[in-house]
């Protein structure tokens, strides 16, 4: 569904930084585009609550109207609430902006559950804790919606950071990041560090929490440890990548790698879970259950529905396996793997049992639209969206939640043959890009 699973996700306080910083390796730093080193003004510019989305503060219009905007690498429209709604504290008031221009065109975006619709226009946009620029960008002013905004989420709009091909109503509507790069000298790259809470937050903590960083125009080396490994962007629509192998605690799922990418694999900050195609999900759950077989958990837990609670501080992380995804590397027949811990795929849920309990939902779920590497994956890593070089980079996040025995990892290279065969070729029809069901 769009809610809770597809769009909204959100996370709170940053986990503890790694105790040991790995020495920086001289990988490809000299080749990295954009400003290098420190982007102090952009660090910690995201906020969030687990399961409800990470948002950045933006201003629109003249004089500037401040709104919190969900950061979504799985869509391509900049869309903001522009009419009163019970779940919105504030909204974009076009009539108060002297720089608003009406495009006299409507836009309608249906999801599997829910929808939003609105009117297209342009206005001046800036990001206070981002680059010091103002750009004229397309804005969809949301006038009607259903199951889109989330009560208490604290965001009022969505910033789609993917490519024009999936923009609504069509690919002629230039996405925000394209406008930003065209109108400024900002390099065509951004990076995300999403910091999961790692433990349930009460409402007070959640409201005051730091969620992470969106670095626009480059890479901040303080946000990761070790080296960055890059995987090619297969096609510029979603941020599509190719998974070549999946392991649970080092055990290969041994599936035809096409299954892992059926019908695509994308990196999506607007999705909470790691979502897997049906066959892959079933095999992965079977393997995770086997690895944690000293315990039995309720059936509804594996469906992402029931919560499992442990006395505070006693969650048995060690009985749950790590999950490794091998991604196509930049070099022929070379891959690398990213490994997440149960601290990433068991999502803390606040305010359900007693304060003496830590409660979690299983945040791996089934998909009918391919693999979605959502927050569950991204919260383990610093993720670089290097649009200029058509690649996505992964490094271990300096804020990922872990324990004294295991940490998330990005490792390589591994020799993997015939990786091109792992990609699924979607039959092209006129309708193919109209499937916005983000269930």
């Amino acid at each position: 569904t769009h809610l809770g699973i597809r769009l909204p996700l959100r996370s709170g306080l940053a986990g503890p930084p790694l105790g040991l910083r790995l020495p920086r390796e001289t990988d490809e730093e000299s080749e990295e585009p954009g400003r290098r080193g420190s982007f102090v003004e952009m660090v910690d510019n995201l906020r969030g609550k687990s399961g409800q989305g990470y948002y950045v503060e933006m201003t629109v219009g003249s004089p500037p109207q401040t709104l919190n905007i969900l950061v979504d690498t799985g869509s391509s429209n900049f869309a903001v609430g522009a009419a009163p709604h019970p779940f919105l504290h504030r909204y974009y008031q076009r009539q108060l902006s002297s720089t608003y221009r009406d495009l006299r065109k409507g836009v309608y975006v249906p999801y599997t559950q829910g929808k939003w619709e609105g009117e297209l226009g342009t206005d001046l946009v800036s990001i206070p804790h981002g680059p010091n620029v103002t750009v004229r960008a397309n804005i969809a002013a949301i006038t009607e919606s259903d199951k889109f905004f989330i009560n208490g989420s604290n965001w009022e709009g969505i910033l789609g950071l993917a490519y024009a091909e999936i923009a609504r109503p069509d690919d002629s509507l230039e996405p925000f990041f394209d406008s930003l790069v065209k109108q400024t000298h900002i390099p065509n790259i951004f990076s995300l560090q999403l910091c999961g809470a790692g433990f349930p937050l009460n409402q007070t903590e959640a409201l005051a929490s730091v969620g992470g960083s969106m670095i626009i125009g480059g890479i901040d080396h303080s946000l990761y440890t070790g080296r960055l490994w890059y995987t090619p962007i297969r096609r510029e629509w979603y941020y599509e990548v190719i998974i070549v192998r999946v392991e649970i605690n080092g055990q290969d799922l041994k599936m035809d790698c096409k299954e892992y990418n059926y019908d695509k694999s994308i990196v999506d900050s607007g999705t909470t879970n790691l979502r897997l195609p049906k066959k892959v999900f079933e095999a992965a759950v079977k393997s995770i259950k086997a690895a944690s077989s000293t315990e039995k958990f309720p059936d509804g837990f594996w469906l992402g529905e029931q919560l499992v609670c442990w006395q505070a501080g006693t969650t048995p992380w060690n009985i749950f396996p790590v999950i490794s995804l091998y991604l196509m590397g930049e070099v022929t027949n070379q891959s690398f793997r990213i490994t997440i811990l149960p601290q990433q795929y068991l999502r803390p849920v606040e305010d359900v049992a007693t304060s003496q309990d830590d409660c979690y939902k299983f945040a791996v779920s089934q998909s009918s639209t391919g693999t979605v590497m959502g927050a569950v994956i991204m919260e383990g890593f610093y993720v670089v969206f290097d649009r200029a070089r058509k690649r996505i980079g992964f490094a271990v996040s300096a804020c990922h939640v872990h324990d004294e025995f295991r940490t998330a990892a990005v490792e390589g290279p591994f020799v993997t043959a015939d990786m091109e065969d792992c990609g699924y070729n979607i039959p092209q029809t006129d309708e193919s890009t109209l499937m916005t069901g983000r269930a």
């Epitope: 077989s293 039995k296 958990f297 309720p298 059936d299 029931q306 359900v352 049992a353």
Partner: antibody, heavy 120, light 108 residues
Framework: QLQLQESGPGLVKPSETLSLTCTVS??????????WGWIRQPPGKGLEWIGM???????WYNPSLKSRVTISVDTSKNQFSLKLSSVTAADTAVYYC????????????WGRGTLVTVSS | EIVLTQSPATLSLSPGERATLSCRAS??????LAWYQQKPGQAPRLLIY???NRATGIPARFSGSGSGTDFTLTISSLEPEDFAVYYC??????????FGGGTKVEIK
């Protein structure tokens, strides 16, 4: 068909340890689809979950009783047991053993129950 | 902590009448809710699980409905053997340790 039967002393002195055993007949306790639990009911009152155990020995306890409760399993005898230490009159209740089925979420089969009175 | 509140505490009805029992959760438990029947001197018996599924051997006159926070157990036409105490239990937060306080259905 599967049956559960509680056994143990009906009278326990204050500060002592209450010990009960549940014998499972008509099926194996080692079947992986179930937990095996204890629930109690003070006279004239509602139901209180005490805890449960998996055949592997993994246990889950009610936080309010955790410091005093031990549940164990003996797969060779097809039995699981409850020990509740430092009992007081407030622990007087009918004690039921039950199977936790339907996705290990509900108590789908119960023993008849045994009344344990705490009194000197 | 999730609290289950059952109402009414006592329901006085005649055989053949329809009984409607309510269980309200302090926060959503999705559809992870069960109903049990307990007759005097007997152990509870599972009637309904997952809000609306009848357990094995339970007569069709018993039905459950609801999701989220509000649930109902309906006995379409009371038989003499249905006069008992009924408990609800949630399993959304697991382990499943929360029961409601009970509703007594007595003969009017």
């Amino acid at each position: 068909q599967l049956q559960l039967q509680e056994s143990g002393p009906g009278l326990v002195k204050p500060s002592e340890t209450l010990s009960l055993t549940c014998t499972v007949s008509g099926g194996s306790i080692s079947r992986g689809s179930y937990y095996w639990g204890w629930i109690r009911q003070p006279p004239g009152k509602g139901l209180e979950w005490i805890g449960m155990i998996y055949y592997s020995g993994s246990t889950w306890y009610n936080p309010s009783l955790k410091s005093r409760v031990t549940i164990s399993v003996d797969t060779s005898k097809n039995q699981f047991s409850l020990k509740l230490s430092s009992v007081t009159a407030a622990d007087t209740a009918v004690y039921y053993c039950a199977r936790v089925g339907h996705g290990v979420s509900y108590f789908d089969l119960w023993g008849r129950g045994t009344l344990v009175t705490v009194s000197s | 902590e999730i609290v289950l509140t059952q109402s009414p505490a006592t329901l006085s009805l005649s055989p053949g009448e329809r009984a409607t029992l309510s269980c309200r959760a302090s926060q959503s438990v999705s559809s992870y809710l069960a109903w049990y029947q307990q007759k005097p001197g007997q152990a509870p018996r599972l009637l309904i699980y997952d809000a609306s599924n009848r357990a094995t051997g339970i007569p069709a006159r018993f039905s459950g409905s609801g999701s989220g926070t509000d649930f109902t157990l309906t006995i379409s036409s009371l038989e003499p053997e249905d006069f008992a105490v009924y408990y609800c239990q949630q399993a959304y937060v697991w382990p499943p340790r929360t029961f409601g306080g009970g509703t007594k259905v007595e003969i009017k």
